[in-house]
């Protein structure tokens, strides 16, 4: 269970891939599209509001083998819209929603080497936000392999 309903902290940051491509958000036909692209030098990076929540549970309850605290994050690039995992379509989408947010909007934060982070679906352990064909997608990572695959690594810069 997530400890409390309010985040322990929030920060505004731009999101980029391990290869320094920017994650951008564009309003098209009344819905938001998410792009992974090289930004022109003078173009300002889109900022995302990251809200961090503590999750506390014994492994027997969670089923994910974690027996203590985890750090969950939600990502909101614009007011009332949050990144959400669509596990059926293996996609990452922006949806307008009210609080309390659905579980699909929560991601377990993993700190990685090179000051990168990864975002694991709360609703589907072992599935991470990743980059596929210049879009964000859900990517299943085999836990027997090293989780360092570059397509699930992201950089946060405030």
């Amino acid at each position: 269970s997530i400890t409390g309903i309010s985040p322990i902290t929030e920060s505004l940051a731009s999101l980029s891939t391990y290869n320094d491509q920017s994650i951008t958000f564009a309003l098209e036909d009344e819905s938001y599209e998410i792009y992974v692209e090289d930004l022109k030098k003078d173009k300002k990076k889109d900022k995302v509001l990251l809200s961090y929540y503590e999750s506390q549970h014994p492994s027997s309850e969670s089923g994910d083998g974690v027996d203590g605290k985890m750090l969950m994050v939600t990502l909101s690039p614009t007011k009332d819209f949050w990144l959400q995992a669509n596990n059926k379509e293996h996609s990452v989408e922006l949806h307008k929603c009210e609080k309390p947010l659905p579980d699909q909007a929560f991601f377990v934060l993993h700190n990685r080497s090179f000051n990168c982070v990864s975002f694991e679906c709360k609703t589907d352990p072992g599935v991470f936000i990743g980059v596929k064909d210049n879009h964000l997608a859900l990517i299943k990572v085999d836990y027997s392999e090293n989780l360092g695959s570059e397509n699930i690594l992201f950089k946060l810069s405030e």
Partner: antibody, heavy 122, light 107 residues
Framework: QVQLVQSGAEVKKPGASVKVSCKAS????????MHWVRQAPGQGLEWMGE????????SYAQKFQGRVTMTRDTSTSTVYMELSSLRSEDTAVYYC???????????????WGRGTLVTVSS | DIQMTQSPSSVSASVGDRVTITCRAS??????LAWYQQKPGKAPKLLIY???RLQSGVPSRFSGSGSGTDFTLTISSLQPEDFATYYC?????????FGGGTKVEIK
Amino acid sequence: QVQLVQSGAEVKKPGASVKVSCKASGYTFISYGMHWVRQAPGQGLEWMGEINPHGGSTSYAQKFQGRVTMTRDTSTSTVYMELSSLRSEDTAVYYCARPSAAYSHYLGIDMWGRGTLVTVSS
Amino acid sequence: DIQMTQSPSSVSASVGDRVTITCRASQGISSWLAWYQQKPGKAPKLLIYAASRLQSGVPSRFSGSGSGTDFTLTISSLQPEDFATYYCQQANVFPLTFGGGTKVEIK
């Protein structure tokens, strides 16, 4: 309960290497990184690096790059820190330490070993 | 690397006093700051994480505040067991770095 049990004190000659072990128990070993922090006599705390026990990836402080190697053995839930080319300034207590949150170091370090004193003297 | 500057380096205080220790980061670290207490011959003990969150089991007389570059640890009413050295640590980016420490001594 969570425990980090470190190997015993070592006395080494300058130029030698030392390998300190840290055996973890009471939690899911591969879900938490393991950090190494040292403290010279009468001095402050100095972060040396971290190993992710899941895949074995490491991050080292620049100061120790090339001299430190962190490894792990998932079958025994043990991490190792080897420091080579020892000099007298490496005389310190070496701690292994586990972050309070799985997968993340953002929430600080809440579990510490008792420390291993490494003395470097000719 | 991010430098963490702690002040004062030592403070003399009496039981019941309010003690404030400050920590400044050389660049912004959001709220990813932890405070530790260390007694001679012992490992550090986590007191505060995420700048202001009290670690489980830590007395409520300890509190933390701040974000960005400036942070504070306050002990509202010093107790005999609080005489120790206190360290701040930025947890935002590798390499993780500690402040130089503040020794709280008996006046």
